[in-house]
Every structure is written in structure tokens, then in C-alpha cells.
Amino acid sequence: SITGISPITESLASLSTYNDQSITFALEDESYEIYVEDLKKDKKKDKVLLSYYESQHPSSESGDGVDGKMLMVTLSPTKDFWLQANNKEHSVELHKCEKPLPDQAFFVLHNRSFNCVSFECKTDPGVFIGVKDNHLALIKVDYSENLGSENILFKLSEILEHHHHHH
């Protein structure tokens, strides 16, 4: 369960892949499309509001019913729209929604060495946001394999204009 309904902190950042391609968002026919592309040098990177939440693990060893905390994140590139996992279609989509946000909008944040992150679906453990054919998709990762596979690694570049949503 998510510990509190308020995020513990928020930040504004641009999102890029391990190979430095930018994640961009375009309004097309009244819905948003997500692209993974090489940006031209003078083009501004799209911003995403990341809201961080704490979530408790169910206990397996500790006697108090919880065994540690996970850090979860929601990603919003524009007001009232959030990235969501569509597990049936193995896709990542932008949906307009109101709070409280559905579970599909929450991703467990994993820090990776070399200061990359990955995003694991709250609703489908072992499934991560990844890059497939120049789009974001949901990718199943076998935990026995190294979770460092490049297609699920992302870089966050904070934009220091503090925490106000960009409309």
C-alpha cells in the first residue's frame, strides 16, 4: 500500500534513454503520443513532473507486518496527464485522470549504477518501462538476469525551475 496520499517530494526533469535519446510527448488528435527520438541540438527537451511516493513491502521476515519501503513514482508530462501501464497491450500510454491515480500510474523506482533509473510496474512486478522500436513499451525482465539491460535504463536530468507544473 502507498504510505501517504501526498508525495514525499517532486521534481521536474527531462527523461532520456541509456543511449541518450529523448523521450518526447506530442498531442495528436486530442490524445498524447510518446516518442523516443534523437533531438536536434537546439530543440528543448520535454519536461516531466515526477512525484515520489513511499510504499510499504508486505512482510516476509520482520514481525511488524512490513519489510521495508519502496520508492514509487508517477510521471506527468503535462497537467492532468500521467504515464500509465497497459499490461494487456504491453504498452505505455498517457491518460488524463484525476486523483487518486490508478495503480497503473505508479512505478517502483530502481536506481541503477552509473546513475540510471528504471521503472517497474506496480501492477505487474517484473515488468518495466522500456524502449522498443522507438516507442515506450512494457518489457518483462527475468530477475535471474541482470536488470541492467540497456533498454529499461533511463536518465533523469533535473530542470531547476522548482516543482511547478508546466502547462
Epitope: 517530494t9 520482520s62 519489510d67 521495508g68 519502496m70 520508492l71 523506482l109 536506481n111 549504477s113 541492467g148
Partner: antibody, heavy 122, light 107 residues
């Protein structure tokens, strides 16, 4: 209750080696990245090394890179730090620490061992 | 590597005083800053994480604020058990780095 207990410290000559252990209990060890931090006598805290939950990714401070090796045995709930080519400036209390979040280091370190002293002297 | 600085390096204060310690990062670290308290011969203890979140069991007289590069730890009414050394740590990126510490002692 989360417990981290370090052992293996002692007196070693310059150029020598030592293996530190950190026995963990009270939590699911295999879900956490773990860290080593050291503190020279009368000085501040210095980050040393990190290992991820399943042991396949490690990271070292420049000051110890190539000389120290971090590892873990999840079946024994134990974290290790192999210290090699020891120098006088490595003399410190070595702490193991657990990060606040299972999957993310952003929350800092919420549990620390009591420390084990490594003395490097001829 | 991200460098962390703290000021003051030491402060003399009395029980009941308000004490403020500042920490500055050499580059932006979002809100990923932790504060620790350490007493002589003891391990550090986490007080604040993610810049402003109080660790479970820590008294509410401790508070943290800031984001980006500038952060503050405030003790609103100093208690006898608060005399210790306080460290900030950036938890944004490897290698994690600590500030040099601020010693709070009795005036």
C-alpha cells in the same frame, strides 16, 4: 528489528589485507542494496562502496578502487568488504549500512552497524 | 563527484536554543539529501531523508528543508541529547558524498 553487525577488523601492516563481514538480520537482506562507509579517527564520514541486492553491480569510491572488493552472500545474509594493499590512510572504523528504500538509494541509509576498526600500522 | 559543504563547522548552543545548519551541494541533487546525527563512539543515525522527511522515531523538533543545491537542518528547541555532530549526505548519485560535519556543543 533490523540489525547489522560488523566483524573482521584488526591490526594489519601496510600492504596487507583483511576481510570485513557484516551480518544482517531482521529484514529481507536480498532485497536491499548495501553500502560501506568509513570514518578515520577524529574525521568525518567517507563513502566507500555499494553493492546492489543480487550482487551483480558494484561501485567504489576512487580512493579504494582496485584495492577493495565488495561482495555479498544472500544465503548467509552477509555483506563483505575485502581490503587489499592497505595504506595508513585506510585506517578507520568501517560501517556497513542499509539503504532506506529496497530499490532506490535516494533515501540515504536508515540502518547502520556499530562499526569495526581497521588499524594500519607497521 | 558532487562536493558537499556544511556551515558552520561548529556551533555552541544552550538547551532550548534554535540551531540551524546549512548544507550546500556543488550541483543540483533534487531533494535527495539525508541528515545524520552521530555521537562519539556511535554509528550515525538517520534523522531526515529526501530533504524534509522525518525518519520514524526522530523527534519533531528536527526538521529539514531545501532542494536543488541548498539545504537546512533545524533543531527548534535543543535538548541535552542533541549535542552531537551532524552530517549531510547527497543520495542523488554515485559516489555518495558527505558534508564535513557540524559539531553542536554546549555553550
Amino acid at each position: 528489528e533490523v540489525q547489522l553487525v560488523e566483524s573482521g577488523g584488526g591490526l594489519v601492516q601496510p600492504g596487507g589485507s583483511l576481510r570485513l563481514s557484516c551480518a544482517a538480520s531482521g529484514f529481507t537482506f536480498s532485497t536491499y542494496s548495501m553500502h560501506w562507509v568509513r570514518q578515520a579517527p577524529g574525521k568525518g564520514l567517507e563513502y566507500v562502496s555499494t553493492i546492489n541486492n543480487n550482487g551483480d553491480t558494484t561501485y567504489y569510491a576512487d580512493s579504494v578502487k582496485g584495492r577493495f572488493t565488495i561482495s555479498r552472500d544472500n544465503s548467509k545474509n552477509t555483506l563483505y568488504l575485502q581490503l587489499g594493499s592497505l595504506r595508513p590512510e585506510d585506517m578507520a572504523v568501517y560501517y556497513c549500512a542499509r539503504q532506506t528504500y529496497t530499490s532506490s538509494w535516494y533515501g540515504g541509509f536508515d540502518s547502520w552497524g556499530q562499526g569495526t576498526l581497521v588499524t594500519v600500522s607497521s | 563527484d558532487i562536493q558537499m559543504t556544511q556551515s558552520p563547522s561548529s556551533v555552541s548552543a544552550s538547551v532550548g536554543d534554535r540551531v540551524t545548519i546549512t548544507c550546500r551541494a556543488s550541483q543540483g541533487i533534487t531533494s535527495w539529501l539525508a541528515w545524520y546525527q552521530q555521537k562519539p563512539g556511535k554509528a550515525p543515525k538517520l534523522l531526515i531523508y529526501a530533504a524534509s522527511n522525518l525518519q520514524s522515531g526522530v523527534p519533531s523538533r528536527f526538521s529539514g528543508s531545501g532542494s536543488g543545491t541548498d539545504f537546512t537542518l533545524t533543531i527548534t528547541s535543543l535538548q541535552p541529547e542533541d549535542f552531537a555532530t551532524y552530517y549531510c549526505q547527497q543520495a542523488n548519485s554515485l559516489p555518495f558524498t558527505f558534508g564535513p560535519g557540524t559539531k553542536v556543543d554546549i555553550k
